[in-house]
Amino acid sequence: HNTTVFQGVEGQSLQVSCPYDSMKHWGRRKAWCRQLGEKGPCQRVVSTHNLWLLSFLRRRNGSTAITDDTLGGTLTITLRNLQPHDAGFYQCQSLHGSEADTLRKVLVEVLADPLDHRDAGDLWVPGESESFEDAHVEHSISRSLLEGEIPFPPTS
């Protein structure tokens, strides 16, 4: 799997999409997990509804939400109020039994808000009471890592 880069602006919402073959993954629940190190496990962040026929319902865990268009074959993850600590490597997964297939490897990059001059009065941050439906979703910038780019750069 190539890694697809999604860039979002700090404080805004980032939408990550993972297309898949709807017939191949028919009946399978999906998940979004965070990769812990190059060879480490992928830690589950949020998964779709327990009942596959209700996968289109938005499920959330903290500031992360997931919804699955099972007929169209697109898994969508929304990271709300993006923060620097959200940057890192993730996976979209298709679950079957205790196994998980990787649908897409994702690198989330968090860009500094160009309008942020550290004047909190000018900065809009979604409040806790605001729903995902109300949150502004920034159109994400995405690209695949070029051949030769190292997804996990060696640590010094």
Partner: antibody
């Protein structure tokens, strides 16, 4: 008139089988998810399972207590949903209702059930 | 699994009274909650979906509110035809009903 009519209930011995039918009329049957619920005498409502609309090709979901014993199916040409109940237990005794899942504006359905049948009684006893 | 706790289990009120029923989920279910009315010997009837949306054709004296774990169903002015048992139903995890609230007229 939009209507659902259940049939097939009755008295059955433990371990035996029974098939319930839910005949729909007044709406485009294939466009809707269909569900079965039950209510034991003097008790509350319990979801049994449901089957997706035609677009979902007969995909089903069940509550844990009936999984492997009950099967939901649908016949689009007859506008009938079925509940096949095998290996029946005394605790399956209940009034069984079929119901239609509400449709959402943007094409998906909603797990709120806006049309219900009158119910059919199933008694499992030796 | 989520537990749905409805209270009270029964109540008696006069015609014209405001009646309130609560439903508490054992964990956050956002607004994934419906309310049904079931009259004796009859099938359930959908009244409220998504916690607060009134089903088409349902009288406006019925309303629902809440999100997260705590939900409220209200009959603003109780009518004789409202004698029934009322159930909440979550759909965040599976499809689980509350135990029901039986409403009677004093």
């Amino acid at each position: 008139e939009v209507q659902l009519v259940e049939s097939g209930g009755g008295l059955v011995q433990p371990g035996r089988s029974l098939r319930l039918s839910c005949t729909a009329s007044g709406f485009t049957f294939g466009d809707y998810a269909m569900s079965w619920f039950r209510q034991a005498p003097g008790k509350g409502l319990e979801w049994v399972g449901f089957i997706g609309s035609k677009a979902y090709g007969g995909t089903t979901e069940y509550t844990a207590s009936v999984k492997g014993r009950f099967t939901i199916s649908r016949d689009g040409s007859k506008s009938i949903a079925y509940l096949q109940m095998n290996s029946l237990k005394t605790e399956d005794t209940a009034v069984y209702y079929c119901a239609r899942g509400k449709r959402r504006d943007y094409g998906y359905w909603h797990p709120a059930f806006d049309v219900w049948g009158q119910g059919t009684m199933v008694t499992v006893s030796s | 699994d989520i537990q749905m706790t409805q209270s009270p289990s029964s109540l008696s009120a006069s015609v014209g009274d405001r009646v309130t029923i609560t439903c508490q989920a054992s964990q956050d279910i956002t607004n994934y909650l419906n309310w049904y009315q079931q009259k004796p010997g009859k099938a359930p009837k959908l009244l409220i979906y998504d916690a607060s949306n009134l089903e088409t054709g349902v009288p406006s004296r019925f309303s629902g509110s809440g999100s997260g774990t705590d939900f409220t169903f209200t009959i603003s002015s109780l009518q004789p035809e409202d004698i029934a048992t009322y159930y909440c139903q979550e759909y965040d995890q599976y499809l689980t009903f509350g135990g029901g609230t039986k409403v009677e007229i004093k």
